[in-house]
């Protein structure tokens, strides 16, 4: 998270790190009590690793009460989703069991109604990607408030040129935006799960490349599909 | 399939004003930037300014200031663009062009002739 | 505004050619988010415009393979490898990256 702050402790309880061999690879964001939904993307970065997600935690490091560490019993990418796109850029993860709830770990509810969110609208995002262009790695949970953009602003040739689909969202991206490390993670809009922060190597913080994140309510089928 | 559907020919007189329309399917109307452009017979094109669908927010290129302006009805998917007091300098082609990719959607052209 | 020139106005071919158009920008098009939007685009007679190439090299969906754009800064080129009857008509270079976006004059490729 590029010019954002340090999240209060647990108060996204939603929060997930994908882990791949004990280090954050992205974020994700707990849906259901066994179910992870993160970014198609993140998959491809694991290669072989073993990827495990990390629920309750707001420091990666330090020992902390509600943190645990779940090992991923089916992974599920979307099946549209490839490597060369953003498209589709969605992944469930199932737990090994059901997660542990209480105040540091419950699922966060998602966006079903499938109506694009007002432009201006202000949405959380949060995640322990960079917070620099240096590639500084936080080891606490960082967020940051950002505006949504309209379609056709994100859709401008000096912006993202078209490539924005229905299926995505954009938000602004002047110097507060998210970056590697935050993908997967969620965007939290009037306490709803609206976005996923999608994976890419998308330059952060220049408001000229918007934050591209995929709609939620345009996968419900899908996401019902892979809980049911 | 993208489409941008323009307005036929008009014959106007020097002074008059003439609204011409832009017609889009095959996209989410509100989805991209309409942008206008002017090519006077036999010569290069010029960009006239562009409008955001979502909100009717306009740039317009400082030459045509007070000579165009450019409007949308999102229920219909239609983008316009109005010009006024007009010379014979004003006779041209008009396109609408849909941004991002690029200008890669094109409408036919409107021809508006000023003649007395 | 950013002034586009384009050379040669006319360029006469014969089928089958190698055809060179050049484009100069009056000042560097390298925007600030660090692309650069240089486009071509083809007129042919009766017609609108049609997108061939976008920043810089890159080939629109469809556009064959004998098109390939070049060039950095100031100064970039449209090459066709071999020319085809369907490839006359006039091309524009174009830059996105300085408001008013503007177009070269032309360059018009006719049969010798």
């Known amino acids: 998270i590029l010019g954002g702050r340090e999240a209060e402790a647990h108060a996204r309880p939603y929060m997930a790190s994908v882990q791949v061999n004990g280090e954050h690879l992205c974020g994700g964001v707990l849906v259901a009590e066994q179910w992870v939904l993160s970014a198609a993307h993140c998959l491809e970065d694991a290669a072989d690793g073993k990827v495990q997600v990390l629920l309750g935690a707001h420091s990666l490091s330090q020992p902390e009460p509600s943190k645990r560490l779940y090992d991923v019993l089916r992974a599920v990418p979307h099946p549209d989703s490839r490597p060369d796109t953003i498209d589709h850029d969605l992944l469930l993860l199932q737990l090994s069991e059901k997660a542990t709830l209480g105040p540091a770990v419950r699922p966060l509810p998602w966006q079903r109604v499938d109506r694009d969110v007002e432009p201006g609208t202000l949405c959380d995002v949060a995640g322990w990607g960079i917070v620099s262009h240096a590639g500084r790695r936080p080891d606490r949970l960082q967020h940051v408030l950002l505006p949504v953009l309209d379609r056709a602003t994100c859709n401008r040739r000096t912006h993202h040129d078209g490539a924005i689909t229905q299926r995505m969202m954009c938000a602004e991206s002047n110097r507060r935006d998210s970056c590697k490390g935050d993908s997967g993670g969620p965007l939290v809009c009037g306490g709803v799960l609206e976005g996923v922060v999608t994976s890419g190597s998308r330059v952060c913080g220049n408001r000229k490349k918007p934050g591209i994140y995929t709609r939620v309510a345009s996968y419900a089928a899908w996401i019902d599909s892979v809980l049911a | 399939e993208v489409q941008l559907q323009q307005s036929g020919p008009e014959l106007v007189k020097p002074g008059a004003s003439v609204k011409i329309s832009c017609k889009a399917s095959?996209?989410?109307?509100?989805?991209?930037?309409m942008n206008w452009v002017k090519q006077s017979h036999g010569k290069s094109l010029e960009w006239i300014g562009d409008i955001n669908p979502n909100n009717g927010g306009t740039s317009c290129n400082q030459k045509f200031k007070g000579k165009a302006t450019l409007t949308v009805d999102k229920s219909s998917s239609t983008a316009y663009m109005e010009l006024r007091s007009l010379t014979s300098g004003d006779s041209a082609v008009y396109y609408c062009?849909?941004?991002?990719?690029?200008?890669?959607?094109w409408g036919q052209g409107t021809l508006v002739t000023v003649s007395a | 505004d950013v002034l586009m020139t384009q050379t040669p106005l006319s360029l006469p071919v014969s089928l089958g050619d190698q055809a060179s158009i050049s484009c100069r920008s009056s000042?560097?098009?390298?925007?600030?988010?660090?692309?650069?939007?240089l486009e071509w685009y083809l007129q042919k007679p009766g017609q609108s415009p049609k997108l061939l190439i976008y920043k810089v090299s890159n080939r629109f969906s469809g556009v064959p393979d004998r098109f390939s754009g070049s060039g950095s800064g100031t100064d970039f080129t449209l090459k066709i490898s071999r020319v085809e009857a369907e490839d006359l008509g006039v091309y524009y270079c174009f830059q996105g990256s300085h408001v008013p976006v503007t177009f070269g004059a032309g360059t018009k490729l006719e049969l010798k």
């Open positions: 062009t849909r941004e991002g990719a690029s200008f890669a959607f």
């Open positions: 000042q560097s098009i390298v925007h600030s988010n660090g692309d650069t939007y």
């Open positions: 095959g996209y989410t109307f509100t989805d991209h930037y």
